[in-house]
């Protein structure tokens, strides 16, 4: 950074609220799509280019003028695996976090024309190419259809679909949000012969209802009704099927073969939580009990003589937790070897750290191939010789991410592929491998400006820089940018990490106001090495506020001792640790302890509210956006994972002890801004409405803002700008800033 250490002598502009809201300084991405083991697609000036990974030369795959006469704005595209067709998506209409409906057309790349016959219907809910060739599966009106050829009629696979009741091949609200993080509940076999799918039945699931006010001209608001199981309520049920797409015919209904859940699941409520094809005729399913400390993996083989799928009990693998729940959010996915007879999976080891274990399908026990007081974040690729994974091992920094490879013939031979590439600039990597892992793109997202590079797996040498954000770097040289500090404090002999966004020309002998930016949900991480341009950048750069985040008990990627500390006790240790962190920060000498604030969104809004309602005296003010206020209001899958059931026999007492409303009286000691979108399908407006009511009932003066028809993201352009402007005013007023 140029300029001097003296802030008064630095004439450069600061990073302003307008810079954040208008995205003045844009991080450049390099989003590629691998189409083979040596080629990828990249969009440049709306042309789709195909690049050769080895040599870096490119040619035009599809010119931007191709669809000039199309008459629709194309939202997205998808090339068939054989490169013969392109699926064009338009008329995109968002539903929930992942789900949407759209219209689709198929363009024949050989004939250079749109296919006009047997088109996919409008308002299609999901479409996916088969992994090879050009079959298509899609979901329309909650039923599944398959196209063997893009120009042939669709074969209808299911007939039971019913809006808000039966979902075939797509998830209901809670499975989308909390289990699969996707709308799709379809899984093609590797060669596209079989199509597996889940069917969800929400017949008995209670509905959340909220008003949608829409255009001013609408005299009566619309009522949105969504099947949404709250904690302890009736859950959706699930069935699982596989259909052979080679058997499809117009003159007979498709035969779907059901694979039932294991007996140990059928005794009570349960979830389907993972589907992974192992080979062309072997599939693994993971099931999870409603009390999410017990899961079972079934491995099922196709029996050609009967056309059925057999899941041998001898091949079941049980995963359980005695200290909390299974997996970080759900059981991790298996990565099968080519023959399908063994797999690698991230599970908790005896010390409570998540590592890679090697399983043989016919054996119960597994062999850990990694170990240490760090965690494997994800398995990224598996070849016959190596397994590639991302971990936070390097330099003992939980908030870092690096790519490693481990030799499968000798687990002691581990190489970090990214650690020493650019150690100052790059400490947080993600990766994208080509189809057979011959090449990979490394995406470094901090602490310096994002850097995208391409590498060869043959010798792990860097081939070329794809994007280095040099243009942005040049622009930011003229801006007084904050610095980021990542460090830890020790509490009860345990390291807890924090980050601070420090104002330009930070002087530790001065006193600064501090805003604690909190999330603090189970397995969260807010202290990391990622470079961001966000609201905190503005607050630090322009308003000279320190913005800090702290990962206390309950946070992730540091072992189960820390993560499972809040098991069955949400609203306790993770709340207390934020207060303690603020106390520790104020002891550091550069924090004005009369000007400490806290803010958070969603779970962070809950923690913010619980902190402000604790009566600690540490915080002057705070902002809660879309907070949870009582765990019985939130969805069953997420809530019960950590809290169990709200019944007297289970954990009702703590459900009732952990509400924001019960702390209403203490809000008299703080300044509080409460914000919520009225159309929040996730954390319902109900949650803030109840906080508001409780505060009013005890005579607390507070500030509030609702955002009409906004969902959990409050992301429409106008609302986004409004909320951050409003929060900025609140924080500035709280800190007595001009």
């Amino acid at each position: 950074n140029k300029g001097t250490d003296d802030a008064t002598a630095d004439s450069r502009k600061t990073y302003t609220l307008t810079d954040y809201l208008k995205n003045t300084y844009r991080l450049k991405l390099y989003s590629l799509r691998w189409i083979s083991d040596h080629e990828y697609l990249y969009k440049q000036e709306n042309n789709i280019l195909v690049f050769n990974a080895e040599y870096g030369n490119s040619s035009v795959f599809l010119e931007n003028s191709t669809f000039d006469e199309f008459g629709h704005s194309i939202n997205d595209y998808s090339i068939s695996p054989d490169g013969q067709f392109i699926l064009l998506e338009y008329n995109y209409v968002k539903q929930w976090r992942h789900s949407y409906t759209a219209s689709y057309d198929i363009y024949d790349l050989n004939k250079r024309q749109l296919i006009t016959e047997e088109r996919i219907p409008n308002n299609t809910q999901w479409v996916t190419w088969s992994p090879v060739g050009h079959k298509l599966a899609y979901v329309w009106n909650n039923d599944i259809y398959v196209k063997i050829e893009p120009n042939l009629p669709s074969y209808r696979i299911t007939w039971t679909g019913k809006e808000d009741i039966i979902y075939n091949g797509i998830t209901d609200w809670v499975y989308e949000e909390e289990v699969f993080s996707a709308y799709s509940a379809l899984w093609w076999s590797p060669n596209g012969t079989f199509l597996a799918y889940a069917q969800f039945n929400d017949t008995e699931v209670p509905l959340i209802e909220y008003s949608f006010y829409s255009d001013e001209s609408l005299q009566y608001p619309k009522t949105v009704r969504v099947p949404y199981p709250k904690a302890g309520a009736v859950n959706p049920t699930v069935k699982f099927f596989v259909v052979n797409t080679d058997s499809l015919s117009s003159v007979t209904n498709a035969t779907s073969i059901q694979i039932t859940a294991p007996a140990s699941m059928l005794i009570g409520d349960h979830y389907l939580c993972d589907v992974t094809w192992a080979t062309q005729e072997r599939i693994s399913l993971q099931w999870l009990r409603r009390i999410q400390n017990y899961s079972v993996m079934d491995i099922c083989d196709y029996d050609e003589s009967s056309g059925r799928w057999n899941c041998l009990v001898a091949r079941q693998h049980i995963e359980m937790s005695t200290t909390g729940w299974v997996g970080r959010f759900r059981p991790s996915e298996p990565h099968f070897t080519l023959d399908g007879n063994s797999f690698y999976k991230i599970i908790s080891n005896e010390e409570g750290y998540r590592h890679i274990c090697y399983f043989q399908i016919d054996k119960k026990d597994c062999t850990f191939i990694t170990k240490g007081t760090w965690e494997v974040i994800g398995i990224e690729a598996l070849t016959s010789d190596y397994l590639y994974y991302i971990s936070n091992e390097y330099k003992g920094m939980p908030g870092g991410r690096n790519l490693y490879k481990i030799q499968l013939s000798d687990y002691t031979k581990v190489t970090c592929l990214s650690c020493e590439l650019n150690p100052e600039r790059c400490q947080y990597y993600s990766v994208s491998f080509s189809k057979e892992a011959k090449y990979y793109q490394l995406r470094c997202s901090g602490p310096g400006l994002p850097l995208y590079t391409l590498h060869s797996s043959v010798n792990d040498k860097g081939l070329r820089v794809l994007e280095d954000n040099s243009a942005l770097d040049k622009m930011l040289q003229n801006v007084q940018m904050p610095s980021k500090k990542l460090d830890f404090i020790i509490l009860n002999e345990t390291k807890f990490w924090y980050q601070m966004i420090l104002p330009p020309h930070f002087d530790k002998s001065k006193k600064y106001p501090l805003l604690l930016d909190v999330y603090a949900g189970p397995c969260s991480q807010k202290a990391d090495t990622v470079f961001r341009l966000n609201w905190a950048t503005y607050l630090a750069s322009t308003e000279n506020i320190i913005v800090a985040s702290f990962d206390g008990r309950g946070s992730g990627y540091q072992g189960d001792k820390i993560m499972h500390a809040i098991n069955r006790r949400l609203g306790t240790f993770e709340v207390e640790d934020q207060i303690e962190a603020a106390r520790q920060f104020s002891k550091m000498g550069f924090v004005d302890n009369k000007r400490i604030a806290i803010w958070g969104w969603s779970y962070g809004g809950y923690v913010t509210s619980m902190v402000l309602g604790s009566g600690s005296g540490v915080f002057k003010c705070g902002i809660a956006v879309a907070p949870v206020s009582r765990w019985e209001y939130y969805d069953s899958v997420y809530t019960e994972r950590y809290m169990g059931l709200p019944t007297p026999e289970d954990n009702l007492d703590h459900y009732r002890n952990s509400t924001v409303m019960s702390r209403a009286e203490n809000f008299k000691q703080v300044e509080y801004l409460l914000i919520h979108g009225t159309a929040d399908d996730n954390v319902h407006f109900q949650q803030s409405a109840q906080i508001s009511k409780a505060l009013v009932d005890v005579g607390v003066d507070f500030q509030a803002m609702w955002y009409t028809d906004e969902d959990h993201g409050i992301a429409s352009s106008t609302a986004h700008q409004h909320i951050y402007t409003h929060m900025s005013h609140f924080i500035k007023q709280c800190f007595s800033l001009p």
Epitope: I148, N244, S247, S250
Partner: antibody
């Protein structure tokens, strides 16, 4: 590669039952349906019935009372039985693989003569 | 049941000629029509499925068109090996039915 082979009696007495076995290779009977089609001397093709991969059968209405199709998946065999044969049932009988909505592989056919 | 009427029932042509065979359905069958070729002493062989899609290994001189009730099989330049009987077949509804055939003979 895909093959279908019919084996039949050649000659059948009137009013007797015709039994033909179709032995297949190169594909699975649990995946693909097998149809039966016949061709009378100097005449066109006539669809008789089908057994689908899942085991379900469909027959032409004209033959439903006297036709039965079954299979043994493990032996890759499909069995065709038609009773009460008359002279006008004399034909070449083909077993045919169903591929979605078309017949992509045909057996070579077995000639059946109904005569006393 | 759906009836298929083929025309002509036979035609005499010379090698190199263009041949057009028609198939008419008694009710709309969308594009669910297939064409087969049969040579004497042999089983029928699939040429075209779903009105216009060439089956694997079938020469490009064969083409199909049509939808609804009227369909056409075209052989652009007749070769010696193309002299045979051609059948259309509908696949939209059971019972599956065939046309009565068109015999292409050498002139």
């Amino acid at each position: 590669q895909v093959k279908l082979q019919e084996s039949g009696p050649g000659l059948v007495q009137p009013s007797q039952t015709l039994s033909i076995t179709c032995t297949v290779s190169g594909f699975s009977l649990t995946t693909y349906g097998v149809h039966w089609v016949r061709q009378s001397p100097g005449k066109g093709l006539e669809w008789l019935g089908v057994i689908w991969g899942g085991g379900r059968t469909d027959y032409d209405a004209a033959f439903i009372s006297r036709l039965s199709i079954s299979k043994d998946n493990s032996k890759s065999q499909v069995f065709f039985k038609m009773n009460s044969l008359q002279a006008n049932d004399t034909a070449i009988y083909y077993c045919v693989r169903n591929r979605h909505d078309w017949f992509d592989y045909w057996g070579q056919g077995t000639t059946v003569t109904v005569s006393s | 049941e759906i009836e298929l009427t083929q025309s002509p029932s036979s035609l005499s042509v010379s090698p190199g000629d263009r041949v057009t065979i028609s198939c008419s359905a008694s009710q709309g069958i969308r594009n669910s029509l297939n064409w087969y070729q049969q040579k004497p002493g042999q089983a029928p062989r699939l040429l075209i499925y779903y009105s216009s899609n060439l089956h694997t290994g079938v020469p490009a001189r064969f083409s199909g068109s049509g939808s609804g009730t009227d369909f056409t099989l075209t052989i652009s330049r007749l070769q010696a090996e193309d002299f045979a009987t051609y059948y259309c077949q509908q696949s939209i509804k059971l019972p599956l039915t065939f046309g009565s055939g068109t015999k292409v003979e050498i002139k």
